[in-house]
């Protein structure tokens, strides 16, 4: 069948999800497409525990996550509610800064060197993290 019962090769399993950490950089939309081609999505951070897990694996490097406000309000790529969900912005972020001179503001969120989040120009070539959930059918304990 099409159920994903274990993580693909080179992915890391954690709390019923699989994670893949890039070592090269792409613009946010291209990173998003890369994840989608893997039947995954850019990482959606829903808890402090997940934040610490991802932070541990990426190190002090700017890294895209699945959060953007390209169409107005901030949205997670998997539909997780932003307003009521976990957030870990740097102080005074997001600020939709226009002073970078690249045109427009800042519409895509990334982990900064200390793990906290910042909004930045979506075209910047940052590393990225893909996430996919293990199927619910595979999460039930085996019958003994």
């Amino acid at each position: 069948g099409s159920e994903r019962t274990c993580c693909p090769v080179n992915w890391v399993e954690h709390e019923r999800s699989c994670y893949w950490f890039s070592r090269s950089g792409k613009a946010w939309a291209d990173a998003d497409n890369y994840c989608r081609l893997e039947d995954a999505h850019l990482v959606v951070v829903t808890s402090w525990e997940e934040q610490k897990f991802v932070q541990h694996h990426i190190g002090p490097v700017n890294t895209w996550m699945g959060l953007h406000d390209q169409n107005g309000p901030w949205k997670w790529v998997d539909g997780t509610d932003y307003e009521t969900g976990f957030k870990n912005w740097r102080p005074e972020q997001p600020d939709d800064w226009y002073g970078h001179g690249l045109g427009g503001g800042e519409d895509c969120a990334h982990f900064t060197d200390d793990g906290r989040w910042n909004d930045d120009v979506c075209q910047r070539p940052y590393r990225w993290v893909c996430e996919t959930e293990l199927d619910k059918a595979s999460q039930e304990p085996p019958l003994l």
Epitope: S24, D30, N33, Y34
Partner: antibody, heavy 121, light 108 residues
């Protein structure tokens, strides 16, 4: 042996439809995203469409969006391209290709032999 | 979309020659650059991925270099089976993956 084999090409009138198939063998088909790439006579390669391994995501070149539909049947190890509203400029050899993903980079590492599609009245 | 431009469109060379083909991207693609070889009536064959990584089974006389917008495919000593068309492809902005128009290497 890892192999891709296309079929379904032929001569079709403008506005007509055609369905291409690509049969895969020698690898775990569902683990790979797949693409269709075409080559018009005497021209370069043009990517047409892609689909993720489990079929959850699809992508199309602007030139075929709304006319072509990519799909796959992993139980049959087969990739499809449904082509509607065909135009003369769709005339080409159509290849199916396997996407190899390595450390964030990707390339097409396995190609079929191609099937010719001719759109003419 | 990112445009890929190859030069020259064709070249004539002899067995044993060193051959260089260039590929230019319309914007920076870092090292997300692949090279393919295609002989008439056959499917393309992946030679090099990620700018300089040789695909399994490809002879070491093929090499790739470059970064950003300018890339080079070099054949250090041309062999009879190397007379073919060579195409570059970017995988930075993908999809859409885009290819160069091809460079035909002919016998002098």
């Amino acid at each position: 042996e890892v192999q891709l084999l296309e079929s379904g090409g032929g001569l079709v009138q403008p506005g007509g439809s055609l369905r291409l198939s690509c049969s895969a063998s020698g690898f775990t088909f569902s683990s790979y995203a797949m693409s269709w790439v075409r080559q018009a006579p005497g021209k370069g390669l043009e990517w047409v469409s892609a689909i993720s391994g489990r079929g959850g995501s699809t992508f199309y070149a602007d030139s075929v969006k709304g006319r072509f539909t990519i799909s796959r049947d992993n139980s049959k190890n087969t990739l499809y391209l449904q082509m509607n509203s065909l135009r003369a400029e769709d005339t080409a050899v159509y290849y199916c290709a396997r996407r190899l993903a390595l450390d964030g980079y990707d390339a097409f590492d396995i190609w079929g032999q191609g099937t010719m599609v001719t759109v003419s009245s | 979309d990112i445009q890929m431009t190859q030069s020259p469109s064709s070249l004539s060379a002899s067995v044993g020659d060193r051959v260089t083909i260039t590929c230019r991207a319309s914007q920076s693609i870092s090292n997300y650059l692949n090279w393919y070889q295609q002989t008439p009536g056959k499917a393309p064959k992946l030679l090099i991925y990620a700018e300089s990584s040789l695909q399994s089974g490809v002879p070491s006389r093929f090499s790739g270099s470059g970064s950003g917008t300018d890339f080079t495919l070099t054949i250090s000593s041309l062999q009879p089976e190397d007379f073919a068309t060579y195409s570059c492809q970017q995988s930075y902005s993908s999809p859409p993956w885009t290819f160069g128009q091809g460079t035909k290497v002919e016998i002098k």
